[in-house]
Interface confidence: medium
Amino acid sequence: DMKGHFDPAKCRYALGMQDRTIPDSDISASSSWSDSTAARHSRLESSDGDGAWCPAGSVFPKEEEYLQVDLQRLHLVALVGTQGRHAGGLGKEFSRSYRLRYSRDGRRWMGWKDRWGQEVISGNEDPEGVVLKDLGPPMVARLVRFYPRADRVMSVCLRVELYGCLWRDGLLSYTAPVGQTMYLSEAVYLNDSTYDGHTVGGLQYGGLGQLADGVVGLDDFRKSQELRVWPGYDYVGWSNHSFSSGYVEMEFEFDRLRAFQAMQVHCNNMHTLGARLPGGVECRFRRGPAMAWEGEPMRHNLGGNLGDPRARAVSVPLGGRVARFLQCRFLFAGPWLLFSEISFISDVVNNSSPALGGTFPPAPWWPPGPPPTNFSSLELEPRGQQPVAKAEGSPTIEFRMD
């Protein structure tokens, strides 16, 4: 629970397939076997129609059939649940595995991968059991597609639910230099390993990754709370030697015009190994992609106890400046800058339309208004719901709710 950021463990609410908060009109598919197995019948635990969505074509070998859910607004999707076909208890069709694709704008689609690059998710073993899949890393998405798989020609059917919460931060993407490798007694890989945008010429752009996944790094950047990952996994880092300018520059794009109160950057400060808090931060603001940067940059010098090796969240006041794009320079104060999380405290400027196509109707199950005073961006819970419990151990563990 970094100040200003969300706690992923609390972002696990059913998003509305089972309880029909997601309307039929927001559920679609590449094809359907019949009207009685149309996309609208794909709600978890529902027995409507013939008890599931079933595609018209075979999913083997092409794996091109998909079920699509439009959440209408950006959400952080932390889990998905799947079931096979009900059919009055007589259904035999289910999907033993599937892939996920997601989009924030309806144009660019990304394939979900786990922390080790695995795309295929284990699905169901029978038609009735619900299998929940913890998504590590989670997806920030408006649209999610399920692509069922099979290892031979056979019928597959699917019922689904998505779990997560509203992405209140409004961050669409960040642009940053590619993270580097620090060589100690072992190599420490400080790359953004879950970034879902593009990488060209040492620059990552158009996506989100580890700096927006809610996972805050440990004091010792070589260690991680994640299981079976490499040294440096939680952090993205850059060496002063590679930046003659003396700073790392990042750009942040948001969903709509916002008044920014603060930026919170979780930084490592293990100075005995070269990691230092930034010496200062300078941010510029603009309202559109082709517009000029507006006004004076906001400058913030960082003080505090230089001998203190704790990782910490640095709060950078942004003075209520209005923008949709921010460009921030983080000044080196030592050999390395290591960040594990960046988040923003902001309020949507009234009457600003979303950057993404179409209008986003207000989600009625979310309390309106600004974030609560403790700045937890994503902890507003849908009324009357309990979050799905986090399984102990592996962050991508599957468990059954039969």
């Epitope: 100040k3 004091d219 010792d220 704790r310 709060s315 005073t373």
Partner: antibody
């Protein structure tokens, strides 16, 4: 579960030195930092010193000349030594840890130290 | 060293009341302020860190806010078990100084 337990002599004569041990369980001293804080009877809290996970230290400058902190990671123990005690050093001495939160999230139950002849 | 001036020193309230405690730092401490609760005969317990983030398991009636030099701690609806002394602490620069404490007593 996480536990910290202080052990000390209870009574110390004026001008003598004090040695207190903090024994921890449920976490490793190589990943967490240990602070010492004291509280005179009926009064507030005073931060004394911290030993960071890597073994480096930061002292309260007002007391630095009298304090010494060390640790044994393998035994999960942290040691505080304070010299030249006076009656106004009478207090409950707590050890507390900080980890990934920038705050002291677990405290020991404290050990009472009385400086008296 | 940074001085944390905490007010008031004493509060006498009834169950159900709203309580506000303030802490003023002698210089800016960003939002590196922590609030602790110490019940009689017990060691302090962490309630709020980073000025406004509630620690795991802390009831949501406890909230904190502030940035720079002025910080506020609020109990929205006091309950009998909230009888305790509350301390602020700056965690910005060593020595990590505490406020003098606020003793909350229930009528």
């Amino acid at each position: 579960q996480v536990q910290l337990k202080e052990s000390g002599p209870g009574l110390v004569a004026p001008s003598q030195s004090l040695s207190i041990t903090c024994t921890v369980s449920g976490f490793s001293l190589t990943s967490y930092h240990i602070h010492w804080v004291r509280q005179p009877p009926g009064k507030g809290l005073e931060w004394l010193v911290v030993i960071w996970s890597d073994g480096s230290t930061t002292y309260n400058s007002a007391l630095k000349s009298r304090l010494s902190i060390s640790k044994d990671n393998s035994k999960s123990q942290v040691f505080l030594k304070m010299n030249s005690l006076q009656t106004d050093d009478t207090a409950i001495y707590y050890c507390a840890r900080t980890g990934n939160f920038y705050a002291m999230d677990y405290w020991g139950q404290g050990t009472s130290v009385t400086v008296s002849s | 060293s940074i001085v944390m001036t905490q007010t008031p020193k004493f509060l006498l309230v009834s169950a159900g009341d709203r309580v506000t405690i303030t802490c003023k730092a002698s210089q800016s401490v960003s939002n590196d302020v922590v609030w602790y609760q110490q019940k009689p005969g017990q060691s302090p317990k962490l309630l709020i860190y980073y000025a406004s983030s509630r620690y795991t398991g802390v009831p949501d009636r406890f909230t904190g806010s502030g940035y720079g030099t002025d910080f506020t701690f609020t109990i929205s609806t006091v309950q009998a078990e909230d009888l305790a002394v509350y301390f602020c602490q700056q965690d910005y620069s060593s020595p990590y100084t505490f406020g003098g404490g606020t003793k909350l007593e229930i009528r």
